[in-house]
């Protein structure tokens, strides 16, 4: 199984001497180290605990441990002029302003650089007028708004509720729907679950607790100023008005206590239906603006924040392979944070910290992985995933070449229920057959595998007996290497029971109170799932970085590209009428979809009966499944947006957290019965189903035996 | 009706002890953080500590942290303060106080205990 | 930690004044205010909380107004019985500090 040339350790305990090395008191002891103040991007602080990652590392035994810095735009209110919303009477005067801050958790009091609750890149504004109610101000919120209720949000401030959709889908929407202001609000329908108490009594979102975020719309592109390359000493800027992504309209999030303020005033039309009730005790009119005897009041958004080019430090080690050293397995995650990290990302950064001391014990005994492992800590993912963009874009063409895989390390946890994965197709069967060597730390699974366990609490739903495995969407580190390189990727976490638990993400989320004692107290008081992970993303990095054959397997996309094409033929065929009409037919990708199905079975066979004692022959096979994810990647990208170039995966234009399968085409087809000239816009779903046959029957073509 | 009585005050010299209690009813007990505050003869209110919902975490004044220790048996709807190596400045009426949450105002308050610390 | 500020220390006034009492937080509070009052050998009992919100059972002859570091409590028209100390508290992180009291005599 994984065996390696340059070890003085017996080839089968290689991966048993790693897990076992795993330590849940010192992830525990990592957590707490890196928790104790705040990390945010761009800050002293954050390059202080870059240089002391650094050194750690080097002290774990990594053979080199660099520095890597770029000079991006980031965003900060500004100190002495802070962000807040008030209601203004006739008269203009100020008769509720929302909170500044923030109550400090217990213990926290006397912490100073506590960054206020603000949304990032929020242009500066003083916008009043009307309130509008969108809901989570989705497309198809807006949808509802504007053509079944006739509610026009032009020239409106409008206030979201946080969930369902990342933030920056958000703002575009509004936008885009004429918005002068966006107000965020976490509803404790989404951040309340019935029976938790609040922070710091439980792992429930209080009153005052604010979501801070980034709100850009970059598409992949990494430093706002500087797209398709590094933001390094010498680097070209675009100005402020070319930068790539940043919103145009001031936005602001609150807490639920301030929210309740702004809502209960609020008449116009009364909410469509009962999906667009939160939990506060208001009516969630819909407005436009306030009822009776509030009407002549309105709200005014007060946002000077600025945006500022800073400093940003990646700390990349390198632990060098002994038989492929230009072969790379990347293990990254992020170290910047919104306050103190509990969960993001210090949760993810103190696995991370644990695996390298592992791999170093390891290299310490005289061991050396087959391939060169990189070990990467990410800075300003908070920003728009700046550090890990810019790194990929400044070492692309070494990627491109070299880059096995990418495993990302963000937050461990967002609940103790399960294990939760997302990641390429090629990676199915290396996840089903590590989860099924390892325990399952679950209550009643005692003495089981955590691959029963997550089976039994997450069900695939295609296949019975196996666990649930989701598409990559973006919002995270994996992003540049996936969605831009084409390099395969995953990620791991435990969660949450998605069953009972309808809030969106974890309720503290990017809030103050994400401190070390919400981990440790509430999520995971003997850091067994944390040691899980740790187990899953580590042993995942060992197999990828040691395995004599890669351990992917391309039968596992065959399966998911039938599935996709099935799917995307089925929406396509909501429009019977109109396929006949523009002559829409999908039989070239499910033609491809067959050949690639074929030509993978037979590479497979392949696989099974080559020479492994060949270097030459098995570069070659280890070369096709390197590349496959690559031969994915359309050099043109997608419409609109160049740095998504995976034609099969994107993050969702409605969602960046949700991936998409055959983004190209899903987008020709959205909406579709809308369109102004349905004979383009049916053009252009016949030219995506050419890309995407194109792209499959290449890919599979890669596969095909060399001569 | 919310009721919250208080007991064990008197007199105690430097360096004793004392132990007071509180008994509640009229509330559902463990659904309320619980406090104690004090009140030196002729001057304002200060906060001594406080306890949250099942006794997991506990809040003092910073002075006070080594010497005193709050607790709660929910079982008997009772909160205790023991004080140890009580000094004359320690000498006040302690109230029992209850609220809501972390960040809450005091809506419940017993009638007060006279703790005199005097040789 | 947060000091509260009261004044006056003690005001005279006569039954159907108007009375104003001022609470200055060192730092931001937003609104995470409370007032109460105290009649002699009694227990303070909760008037107003929020900074704004009217407790159970007081009369609406009290108000409260302000955010952030600036709180006032106004007693529209003092009634016989609204002689005593009143209190503001903080509840905005620990240790939740009182202002030091305005006592309100009979002119």
């Known amino acids: 199984k994984s065996s390696n040339e340059a070890t003085n350790i017996t080839p089968k305990h290689n991966m048993k001497a790693f897990l076992d090395e795993l330590k849940a008191e010192n992830i525990k002891k990592f957590l707490y180290n890196f928790t104790q103040i705040p990390h945010l991007a761009g800050t002293e602080q954050n390059f202080q605990l870059a240089k002391q990652i650094q050194s750690q590392w080097k002290e774990f035994g990594l053979d080199s441990v660099e520095l890597a810095h770029y000079d991006v735009l980031l965003s900060y209110p500004n100190k002495t002029h802070p962000n807040y919303i008030s209601i203004i009477n006739e008269d203009g005067n100020e008769i509720f302003n929302t909170s500044l801050f923030e109550p400090p958790p217990p213990g926290y009091e006397n912490v100073s650089d506590i960054v206020p609750p603000f949304s990032a890149f929020s242009p500066q504004g003083m916008p009043e007028g009307d309130l509008v109610y969108v809901n989570y101000a989705r497309t198809e919120d807006f949808f509802k708004l504007e053509r079944d209720m006739k509610i026009n949000c032009s020239g409106k401030i409008v206030i979201a509720r946080y969930g369902k959709v990342f933030r920056g889908n958000k703002v575009k929407n509004a936008q885009l729907a004429g918005a002068k202001g966006v107000i965020l609000y976490s509803d404790p329908a989404d951040y309340f679950a019935p029976g938790v108490k609040s922070y710091p009594d439980g792992w429930n979102l209080p009153g005052g607790g604010v979501q801070r975020g980034n709100i850009l719309n970059l598409n992949g592109a990494g430093d706002p100023l500087t797209p398709g390359y590094p933001a390094n000493e010498y680097a070209y800027r675009r100005g402020i008005a070319e930068a790539v992504g940043l919103p145009s309209i001031p936005v602001h999030p609150i807490g639920y206590y301030d929210a309740q303020k702004l809502l209960e005033k609020m008449g116009g039309s009364a909410p469509p239906d009962s999906s667009w009730r939160g939990s506060l005790k208001v009516p969630y009119n819909v407005g436009p603006g306030f009822t009776g005897n509030f009407s002549t009041q309105k709200v005014k958004m007060h946002i000077h924040s600025t945006n500022e080019v800073t400093r940003i430090y990646n700390v990349i080690g390198t632990l060098r392979g002994a038989v492929e050293p230009d072969r790379y397995v990347i293990l990254g995650g992020h170290r910047d944070s919104w306050v103190f990290g509990g969960i993001d990302p210090q949760s993810g950064a103190a696995v991370v910290h644990e695996i390298v001391r592992s791999f170093g014990t390891l290299k310490k005994e005289g061991w050396r992985p087959r391939r060169t492992i990189l070990f990467a800590s990410w800075d300003a993912e908070e920003f728009g995933l700046l550090g890990s963009t810019e790194w990929a874009e400044e070492n692309s063409r070494l990627l491109q070449e070299r880059g096995v895989a990418y495993i990302n390390a963000d937050s461990s946890i967002e609940g103790n229920y399960t294990l939760r994965v997302d990641c390429t197709p090629l990676m199915y069967s290396l996840v089903h057959n590590l989860t099924k060597e390892l325990k399952s730390p679950d209550e009643g699974f005692e003495g089981k595998s955590l691959y029963e366990s997550w089976t039994k609490k997450s069900p695939s739903p295609e296949f019975s007996g196996m666990p649930r495995i989701s598409k990559l969407g973006s919002g995270n580190d994996f992003e540049v290497f996936f969605q831009r390189l084409g390099i395969a990727s995953g990620r791991a976490r435990y969660t949450k029971n998605w069953e009972t638990n309808k809030f969106s993400g974890y309720p503290l989320y990017h809030s103050v109170y994400e401190t070390y004692e919400l981990v440790e107290k509430f999520y995971d008081p003997m850091f067994k799932y944390h040691l899980t992970v740790a187990q899953v993303r580590g042993g995942m990095v060992f197999e990828l970085a040691n395995s004599i054959v890669l351990p992917f397997d391309c039968r596992d996309y065959a399966v998911v590209l039938r599935k996709y094409a099935d799917k995307i033929y089925s929406i396509s065929m909501k429009h019977p009428q109109e396929m006949k009409t523009y002559s829409v037919s999908f039989d070239s990708l499910f033609s491809a979809v067959k050949n690639f199905t074929e030509i993978a079975s037979k590479f497979s066979e392949r696989l099974q009966d080559f020479d492994k004692s060949n270097p030459i022959v098995l570069r070659m096979m280890n070369d096709q499944l390197m590349f496959l994810e690559r031969a994915f990647i359309d050099p043109l990208g997608l419409p609109d947006r160049p740095f998504y170039r995976h034609v099969i995966y994107a993050p969702s234009s409605h969602n960046k957290y949700a991936g998409e399968s055959f983004p190209g085409i899903y987008d020709a087809l959205f909406d579709i019965e809308s369109k102004v000239d349905p004979s383009k816009a049916w053009g252009e779903v016949k030219r995506q189903i050419y890309v995407a046959a194109f792209t499959v029957q290449a890919a599979a073509e890669t596969l095909s035996e060399v001569a | 009706e919310v009721q919250l009585v208080e007991s064990g005050g008197g007199l105690v010299q430097p360096g004793g002890s004392l132990r007071l209690s509180c008994a509640a009813s009229?509330?559902?007990?463990?659904?309320?953080?619980m406090a104690w505050v004090r009140q030196a003869p002729g001057k304002g209110l200060e906060w001594v500590a406080s306890i949250n919902y099942d006794g997991s975490s506990t809040y003092y004044l910073d002075s006070l942290k080594s010497r005193f220790t709050i607790s709660r048996d929910n079982a008997k709807n009772s909160l205790y303060l023991q004080m140890n190596s009580l000094r004359a400045e320690d000498t006040a009426v302690y109230y029992c106080?209850?609220?809501?949450?972390?960040?809450?105002?005091?809506?419940?308050w017993g009638q007060g205990t006279l703790v005199t610390v005097s040789s | 930690d947060i000091q509260m500020t009261q004044s006056p220390s003690s005001l005279s006034a006569s039954v159907g004044d108007r009375v104003t009492i001022t609470c200055r937080a060192s730092g931001n509070i937003h609104n995470y205010l409370a007032w109460y009052q105290q009649k002699p050998g009694k227990a303070p009992k909760l008037l107003i909380y929020?900074?704004?919100t009217l407790a159970d059972g007081v009369p609406s002859r009290f108000s409260g107004s302000g955010s952030g570091t600036d709180f006032t409590l106004t007693i529209s028209s003092l009634q016989p019985e609204d002689f005593a100390t009143y209190y503001c508290q903080h509840f905005w992180s620990t240790p939740p500090t009182f202002g030091g009291g305005t006592k309100v005599e009979i002119k």
């Open positions: 929020n900074a704004e």
């Open positions: 106080a209850g609220s809501d949450g972390y960040w809450a105002w005091f809506a419940y």
């Open positions: 009229g509330f559902t007990f463990s659904d309320y953080y």
